[in-house]
Interface confidence: low
C-alpha cells in the first residue's frame, strides 16, 4: 500500500493511473466504502463523503489515463485509506495527515519557551526533528519544547516529520520579542546631556503596550520610577514622570530618553521594561550611567567617577602630554599640589579611553 | 483614586434589552481597560468581556457573542454593557471593573464597581 | 477554557488564626492569578496580583503562593475586618475565568 503524508491546511494529489491511456469510468472511495468522487463520461460526479466541498480531480488529466483525486484545505481526519476503482482494479493510498503549531503564539518574549506540538492521526507513530535558525537540533515525539529562547531563535524553524520512511517538512515563523541589547553603559562627564535608546530587535506591524524605567542610584537607598509610558501603535506617550530628574522621551521608536544633564546623584543602573499587549511577561533592558566629575578644591585636584564601574577599571589624573600622575583602580583619585596646566582625568579600560574629563590649574603667584 | 459608580437596579422582560452604565471618577476613561462580569444568584463570577482602549478592541467571551456590547462614552467617562434578548437566567449583578492605572496590566481588574442588579421576569 | 477549583467553599475561622484558600487551575497559568475579597454591599477589592505579589495597601498578614496549576491565599493572624467573601481570577487565557468563591467567617 502506498503512503502518501500530507500537511494540515495544504492540498493533496493522490493518484491514479489506468493501463489504457484514455477516459474511462473511475471511482474513488474511503475505507468505509463511501463513495469521494469518479466521472459519468466527461462529468466529474461527487459522492456522500465528508470531503464533498473539498474534493476534485484533472479532467484533463483523464484522457492520458490519470485520474487524481486531489484534496484541498486537508485535516487531521482526512487521514485515511483511499481506493481508487478503475479497469476492475484497487489501487489503495495511505493518507497520513499532520499538523505542526506552535504554542499559543509565534511571536514570544526572550527567555519564554516554544513548544511545538504535532497534531497526528490515531495509530501513526511519527518523529520530529527541528532545525533552529542558529542550528540547533532538537528531537522529540508529540511536543518539542525550548526553554529559553534567546535572540538568535527568531526566524524559520524548519520541522520534519517523519513517517513510514516518508518526510514532510513544517515551516515556522518565530519572532523572538526583545530588546537589540541585554544591557548598555553610558559614560558622561557631569553636567553633559545623557541620551539612552532602547532598540527593540525585531519589527511588528502594530505594537501595543507599556513600560517603565525603574532607576537605582548609587547614592539611594532605594529604587525609583522615573517614568512610565504607552505604546500604542508604534507611538510613544508620557503617562507619569518623576520631577527630578525631569527625563523627556521621544515618541516614536527606538525608544529613545533624554537626561537633560549627568549628575553625581544620578548615577546608578536603570531596568526599562516593556509589557506588549497580550503578551504574559515583560522584555527588559538594563542600562547604567556612569558620571566623572574633576574638581580643583584649594590645593587638592580630585577626579570622582559614580555609578556602576567595574573593578578592573583603571582612573588617571595625568597633566597633558605626560605620564598620568596618579592611576588607580579607584573612583577617586587626586593630586596635592598639582602643577599648573592642563589636566586630564581619564576613565580607561584596558588601554581604552570611556570617558575624559579636563581641567584647568592655574599657575599660583 | 479611580471610582466606579454603576446605574441602579432595572427588572426587565423576557426578550428586551438592559443597558448598564458604570461612571468613572478620578481618571480618565480613555487610558482605562474596563471588564464586565455578572453574577448569578447562589453562582461564581463569570466574566462577559472587556473594552482596551488602547486599541479599541473589545474582547467578549464567546459565551456572550453576539448578545453583548460593550461601549464608552468617553466625554462622560462613562462605559456601558448592552445585553440583548434577556432570558431568566440573566437575572444577575452585573459588575464593572477597571485596569485602573496599572502601568502594564491592562487585564488587572484592580477598582470594581458595586454591581447593578437585573432582574428577568415575566 | 480554564476551570478554577476553589476550596473551601466555606470556612469559619477565630481572631488569630491563620486560614490558606487554594484555587486548582484546570491547566498551567503560570503566574497569572489575582485575588480579591469582597463584603456584602461593596466593591471587590484587589488584594494580589500575579499570585504573589500583595497590593499596595493591603495589610501584610495576607499573602499569595503558587505557580502553574495550584495555587493558595494565607491569611495570617486573622482578623474580624478580614471576614468576607475571597475569590481567585486568572487573566491567562480568554475567557477570564474566576474560582466558585469562599465565604470566610470570623467566630
Known amino acids: 500500500k502506498k503512503v502518501v503524508l500530507g500537511k494540515k491546511g495544504d492540498t493533496v494529489e493522490l493518484t491514479c493511473t489506468a493501463s489504457q491511456k484514455k477516459s474511462i469510468q473511475f471511482h474513488w472511495k474511503n475505507s468505509n466504502q463511501i463513495k469521494i468522487l469518479g466521472n459519468q463520461g466527461s462529468f466529474l460526479t461527487k459522492g456522500p463523503s465528508k470531503l464533498n466541498d473539498r474534493a476534485d480531480s484533472r479532467r484533463s488529466l483523464w484522457d492520458q489515463g490519470n485520474f487524481p483525486l486531489i484534496i484541498k484545505n486537508l485535516k487531521i481526519e482526512d487521514s485515511d485509506t483511499y481506493i481508487c476503482e478503475v479497469e476492475d482494479q484497487k489501487e489503495e493510498v495511505q493518507l497520513l495527515v499532520f499538523g505542526l503549531t506552535a504554542n499559543s503564539d509565534t511571536h514570544l518574549l526572550q527567555g519564554q519557551s516554544l513548544t511545538l506540538t504535532l497534531e497526528s492521526p490515531p495509530g501513526s507513530s511519527p518523529s520530529v526533528q527541528c532545525r533552529s535558525p542558529r542550528g540547533k537540533n532538537i528531537q522529540g515525539g508529540k511536543t518539542l519544547s525550548v526553554s529559553q529562547l534567546e535572540l538568535q531563535d527568531s526566524g524559520t524553524w524548519t520541522c520534519t516529520v517523519l513517517q513510514n520512511q516518508k518526510k514532510v517538512e513544517f515551516k515556522i515563523d518565530i519572532v523572538v520579542l526583545a530588546f537589540q541589547k541585554a544591557s548598555s553603559i553610558v559614560y558622561k562627564k557631569e553636567g553633559e546631556q545623557v541620551e539612552f535608546s532602547f532598540p527593540l530587535a525585531f519589527t511588528v506591524e502594530k505594537l501595543t503596550g507599556s513600560g517603565e524605567l525603574w532607576w537605582q542610584a548609587e547614592r539611594a537607598s532605594s529604587s525609583k520610577s522615573w517614568i512610565t509610558f504607552d505604546l500604542k501603535n508604534k507611538e510613544v506617550s508620557v503617562k507619569r514622570v518623576t520631577q527630578d530628574p525631569k527625563l523627556q522621551m521621544g515618541k516614536k521608536l527606538p525608544l529613545h530618553l533624554t537626561l537633560p544633564q549627568a549628575l553625581p546623584q544620578y548615577a546608578g543602573s536603570g531596568n526599562l521594561t516593556l509589557a506588549l499587549e497580550a503578551k504574559t511577561g515583560k522584555l527588559h533592558q538594563e542600562v547604567n550611567l556612569v558620571v566623572m566629575r574633576a574638581t580643583q578644591l584649594q590645593k587638592n585636584l580630585t577626579c570622582e567617577v559614580w555609578g556602576p564601574t567595574s573593578p578592573k577599571l583603571m582612573l588617571s589624573l595625568k597633566l597633558e602630554n605626560k605620564e598620568a600622575k596618579v592611576s588607580k583602580r579607584e573612583k577617586a583619585v587626586w593630586v596635592l599640589n598639582p602643577e599648573a596646566g592642563m589636566w586630564q582625568c581619564l576613565l580607561s579600560d584596558s588601554g581604552q579611553v570611556l570617558l575624559e574629563s579636563n581641567i584647568k590649574v592655574l599657575p599660583t603667584w | 483614586q479611580v471610582q466606579l459608580v454603576q446605574s441602579g437596579a432595572e427588572v426587565k422582560k423576557p426578550g428586551a434589552s438592559v443597558k448598564v452604565s458604570c461612571k468613572v471618577s478620578?481618571?480618565?476613561?480613555?487610558?482605562?481597560?474596563m471588564h464586565w462580569v455578572r453574577q448569578a444568584p447562589g453562582k461564581g463570577l463569570e466574566w462577559m468581556g472587556y473594552f482596551n482602549p488602547r486599541d479599541g478592541e473589545t474582547i467578549y467571551a464567546q459565551k456572550f457573542q453576539g448578545r453583548v456590547t460593550m461601549t464608552e462614552d468617553t466625554f462622560t467617562d462613562t462605559a456601558y454593557m448592552e445585553l440583548s434578548s434577556l432570558r431568566s437566567e440573566d437575572t444577575a449583578i452585573y459588575y464593572c471593573?477597571?485596569?485602573?492605572?496599572?502601568?502594564?496590566?491592562?487585564?488587572?481588574?484592580?477598582?470594581w464597581g458595586k454591581g447593578t442588579t437585573v432582574t428577568v421576569s415575566s | 477554557e480554564t476551570t478554577l477549583t476553589q476550596s473551601p467553599a466555606f470556612m469559619s475561622a477565630t481572631p488569630g488564626d491563620k486560614v490558606n484558600i487554594s484555587c486548582k487551575a484546570s491547566q498551567d497559568i503560570d503566574d497569572d492569578m489575582n485575588w480579591y475579597q469582597q463584603k456584602p454591599g461593596e466593591a471587590a477589592i484587589f488584594i494580589i496580583q500575579?499570585?504573589?505579589t500583595l497590593v499596595p495597601g493591603i495589610p501584610p498578614r495576607f499573602s499569595g503562593s503558587g505557580y502553574g496549576t495550584d495555587f493558595t491565599l494565607i491569611i495570617n493572624n486573622i482578623e474580624s475586618e478580614d471576614a468576607a467573601y475571597y475569590f481567585c481570577l486568572q487573566h491567562d487565557n480568554f475567557p477570564y475565568t474566576f474560582g466558585q468563591g469562599t465565604k470566610l467567617e470570623i467566630k
Open positions: 471593573a477597571t485596569g485602573g492605572d496599572s502601568d502594564y496590566y491592562y487585564y488587572y481588574m484592580d477598582v
Open positions: 500575579e499570585a504573589t
Open positions: 478620578g481618571y480618565t476613561l480613555t487610558a482605562l481597560s
